[in-house]
């Protein structure tokens, strides 16, 4: 019986060349997390965080992805091509899989600075 819920950072924007934290949090379940997978919009795996083996960052992303904080992921040196959906998949016993979605929009530097001025604190 899946009782848990995944909370994510939702829709986020960041500026080109900058960095962003992708964060998911699983709550309201007694289930034990054995692995968390991070995927990009085209279903390519960015990273896996395994309860025993720790982090594995896939070679294509080694230079631009840093593990953490926690079970999250930090994306660095953002390009316009990084715009799109990101998914965290929690493998849990005995509940099964929980999946969270984050949409990242990478903005040109000037646009990002402009939109930041109008963000509500």
């Amino acid at each position: 019986m899946m009782t848990g819920t995944i909370e994510t950072t939702g829709n986020i924007s960041a500026k080109k060349g900058g960095s962003v934290i992708l964060q998911c949090h699983l709550s309201s379940t007694m289930a034990q997390v054995t692995q968390v997978n991070w995927e990009q919009h085209d279903h390519s795996l960015l990273a896996i965080r395994n309860a025993e083996l720790g982090w594995h960052i896939y070679p294509a992303f080694k230079d631009r992805v840093a593990p953490g904080p926690g079970l999250g992921l930090t994306l660095q040196s953002l390009t316009m091509n990084d715009t799109g959906e990101y998914f965290c998949t929690y493998h849990t016993y005995p509940d099964g899989t929980y999946r969270g979605r984050i949409f990242l929009e990478v903005l040109e530097s000037s646009v990002a600075e402009h939109s930041a001025r109008f963000q509500i604190p």
Partner: antibody
Framework: EVQLVQSGSELKKPGASVKVSCKAS????????MNWVRQAPGQGLEWMGW????????TYAQGFTGRFVFSLDTSVSTAYLQISSLKAEDTAVYYC???????????????WGQGTMVTVSS | DIQLTQSPSFLSASVGDRVTITCRAS??????LAWYQQKPGKAPKLLIY???TLQSGVPSRFSGSGSGTEFTLTISSLQPEDFATYYC????????FGGGTKVEIK
């Protein structure tokens, strides 16, 4: 070598309590959930429940609430099963079993303790 | 709870026989099924997980198939050490075991 080693056989009187230990070695204890399984003489396997080795939270299967308690001592990589107010029908072999596999597709009880025979008799 | 029904409960066979054991689930469990072998006085041993994946160190004469509600364990050529009781287990939700199949010498 990855293994689970359980405490020895117990002979108890009705109404007494028993505590069975299950010591893990050869792997990261807190990375894998731990289950308890009962097998009455000449019978099949019955899942009793499991304990989250990260948080210590136990979950009990139907029929195993009240008198049964799962606990942990992570400092010595050991899981425990305590049964109170023992009855004759608690006579069985009790196994601890680790959930192996990292993704849900690979989950199974890959490592088992050797079993602890608990006999309840007056 | 998901119920698992194993058939047959008892099976008499000879060395070299091909043996098939069936496990039916009361509802769909995808491929979240494992098979175990248990010999008298011993703990169960994992043979197959994810319905068809052979556990490391298990002889290739053992194979598993199926998905959804119907699963089979096949021993292609029964060996003397294979006489034992076999259990299926679902891990789609809280785990449950089938009633077991005892494979005896004919």
């Amino acid at each position: 070598e990855v293994q689970l080693v359980q405490s020895g056989s117990e002979l108890k009187k009705p109404g007494a309590s028993v505590k069975v230990s299950c010591k893990a070695s050869g792997y990261t204890f807190t990375a894998y959930p731990m289950n308890w399984v009962r097998q009455a003489p000449g019978q099949g396997l019955e899942w009793m429940g499991w304990i989250n080795t990260n948080t210590g939270n136990p979950t009990y299967a139907q029929g195993f609430t009240g008198r049964f308690v799962f606990s942990l001592d992570t400092s010595v990589s050991t899981a425990y099963l305590q049964i109170s107010s023992l009855k004759a029908e608690d006579t069985a072999v009790y196994y601890c079993a680790r959930v192996g596999g990292y993704s849900v597709y690979d989950y199974a009880f890959d490592i088992w303790g050797q079993g602890t025979m608990v006999t309840v008799s007056s | 709870d998901i119920q698992l029904t194993q058939s047959p409960s008892f099976l008499s066979a000879s060395v070299g026989d091909r043996v098939t054991i069936t496990c039916r689930a009361s509802q769909g469990i995808s491929s979240y099924l494992a098979w175990y072998q248990q010999k008298p006085g011993k703990a169960p041993k994992l043979l197959i997980y994810a319905a068809s994946t052979l556990q490391s160190g298990v002889p290739s004469r053992f194979s598993g198939s199926g998905s959804g509600t119907e699963f089979t364990l096949t021993i292609s050529s029964l060996q003397p050490e294979d006489f034992a009781t076999y259990y299926c287990q679902q891990l789609n939700s809280y785990p449950t075991f089938g009633g077991g199949t005892k494979v005896e010498i004919k």
